[in-house]
């Protein structure tokens, strides 16, 4: 972004923001917006949240275009009400490890997070959580009955993993990765971060790469079939190109996405790989940018639900799938 | 009545100081840019300087800079031009102009101050 | 610098005639965001200047509709449809897309 010319603003008045969010200066001391918060998309037009002590961080140069609101090194993380250290690992509960890493918290499921597709010997898998047991099983008993306003989007559920051995010991080093989060946007673009140590140096860093659960645009539940209540993983008629922050992906794509359910399941992605898409500037500049490609999606009740405070924010915020 | 005083213009020898101040009423002062802009006698307008909401960014004419300085104080809903090192040809009547930020510029004008640069 | 042309520099109108001011801008005035930050003010004998025009063809709240503006790239222009008295004075286009921002030399419109 070239600050040099006048300032010009849109033509509507200051947004307003939502509660905690502060209203700030632009990148180039132009105009008003509302700031990025952590795991953000930032440009220099939109940057982060300077009260809450996040940058923007473009990863490499090359690509001073579009980065992610990063907390600044060694910021600390407020985890259900309590402060951990950056660099602290804690058991959230029974059933995550988890690691506060400059502001960002990266955790790891101690329980399976396998997804079940429904068989003809249990139509209607659901995990539940048993008494005395911290980590929930599979039951196939009947659904109840669900009344559902719409189809039920979500991006936010756990996938299969790929990539290293969460486990795997090199060098002195014992290798550890986060799971990648869930999507930040059930549609359009948005990010997913995770935490690794999987470097030269076994320093913890953070890794983000961009995600698209489903484009916005598309009507999904138009494309169910009849007397279907889903639709999986919806044929894209044609290539497209991604869009980001005015950027436009230099290849056209043949991308998987997920669909919808209009029975109250949700449709995430189940497996899913991680490749360098590069993307060209109206300016001619080009950057790279990692992104999440779907391979495969799965439609499923194990729904994010808010009895539980860690796992709503685990399968709404940070964490999701490993590619 | 949304409106814009001008004060501070005279008569300054070459080589002089000034500082122009505007004052602002009837509006939000925070929420508009500020301008200042000049008419020497007899010719046209030309455009001296502007400054954001907050005073943290401001533009002014390349010739102009190291000689102006523009600033604004929010709490007194004011903005200045301090002008050092004057010359006989910063002579003019000196506006002061409320600039939207984002549809048009320049909506609200003050009734401008002289300055004159004479030995 | 962006230089601001205007033709004629001075025009003599009779009441209910049309005015037409020409303003040439010596390299396109589209800013980095895509819109044309042309505008065009006058100045009546002994007052400040007021907006009339903004963003080529917007008029300021108060304007008359017989005042309209229009052009694109490098060449607009402010028509009067039906001169009236009061409308005269100095008018003024200005460019706000590029540093420095820069006005026109004037057109002086003078009433037959």
């Known amino acids: 972004q070239n600050c040099s010319g006048p300032c010009r603003c849109p033509d509507e008045p200051a947004p307003r923001c939502p509660a905690g969010v502060s209203l700030v200066l632009d990148g180039c001391g132009c105009c008003r917006v509302c700031a990025k918060q952590l795991g953000e998309l930032c440009t220099e037009r939109d940057p982060c949240d300077p009260h809450k002590g996040l940058f923007c961080d473009f990863g490499s140069p090359a690509n001073r275009k579009i980065g992610v609101c990063t907390a600044k090194d060694g910021a600390p993380c407020i985890f259900g009400g309590t402060v951990y250290r950056s660099g602290e690992s804690f058991q959230s509960s029974c059933k995550y490890q988890c690691t506060c890493l400059d502001g960002a918290v990266g955790c790891m499921p101690l329980c399976s997070m396998d997804v079940r597709l429904p068989s003809p010997d249990c139509p209607f898998p659901r995990r539940v959580k048993l008494p005395g047991k911290c980590c929930e099983e599979w039951v196939c008993d009947e659904p109840k009955d669900q009344t559902v306003v719409g189809p039920a989007l979500a991006a936010y559920r756990l996938e299969d993993t790929f990539g290293p051995d969460p486990t795997m010991i090199r060098a002195n080093c014992l290798v550890q990765t986060t799971e990648w989060s869930a999507c930040s946007k059930t549609c359009g673009m948005g990010i997913s971060t995770r935490v690794t140590n999987d470097n030269a140096s076994c320093r913890l860093e953070k890794q983000s790469r961009l995600c698209m659960v489903r484009p916005c645009e598309a009507d999904l539940e138009e494309n169910i079939k009849k007397g279907k209540k889903c639709i999986r993983t919806p044929k894209i008629s044609k290539p497209i190109k991604f869009e980001l922050s005015g950027c436009t992906s230099m290849k056209t794509y043949r991308a998987k996405f997920c669909g919808v359910c209009t029975d109250g399941r949700c449709c995430t992605p189940h497996r899913t790989t991680t490749l360098p898409v590069e993307f060209k500037c109206p300016d001619g500049e080009v950057m790279k940018k990692n992104m999440m490609f779907i391979k495969t999606c799965a439609c499923h009740y194990n729904c994010p639900g808010d009895n539980d405070i860690f796992e709503s924010l685990y399968y709404r915020k940070m964490y999701g799938d490993m590619a | 009545e949304v409106q814009l005083v001008e004060s501070g213009g005279g008569l300054v020898q070459p080589g002089g100081s000034l500082r122009l101040s505007c004052a602002a009423s009837?509006?939000?002062?925070?929420?508009?840019?500020m301008a200042w802009v000049r008419q020497a006698p007899g010719k046209g307008l030309e455009w001296v300087a502007n400054i954001n909401y907050y005073g943290s960014r401001t533009d002014l004419l390349a010739s102009l800079k190291s000689r102006f300085t523009i600033s604004r104080d929010n709490a007194k809903n004011s903005v200045y031009l301090q002008m050092n090192s004057l010359r006989a040809e910063d002579t003019a009547v000196y506006y002061c102009?409320?600039?939207?930020?984002?549809?048009?510029?320049?909506?609200?004008w003050g009734a401008g101050t002289t300055v004159t640069v004479s030995s | 610098d962006i230089v601001m042309t205007q033709t004629p520099l001075s025009l003599s109108v009779s009441l209910g005639d049309q005015a037409s001011i020409s303003c040439k801008s010596s390299q396109s005035i589209v800013h980095y965001n895509e819109k044309t930050y042309l505008e065009w003010y006058l100045q009546k004998p002994g007052q400040s200047p007021q907006l009339l025009i903004y963003?080529?063809?917007s008029r300021a709240s108060g304007v008359p509709d017989r005042f309209s503006g229009s052009g694109s790239g490098t060449d607009f222009t402010l028509k009067i449809s039906r001169v009236e008295a009061e409308d005269l004075g100095v008018y003024y286009c200005f460019q706000g897309s590029h540093f420095p921002l820069t006005f026109g030399q004037g057109t002086k419109l003078e009433i037959k």
């Open positions: 963003k080529v063809s």
């Open positions: 009837g509006f939000t002062f925070s929420d508009y840019y």
């Open positions: 102009a409320r600039d939207t930020s984002r549809g048009s510029y320049f909506d609200v």
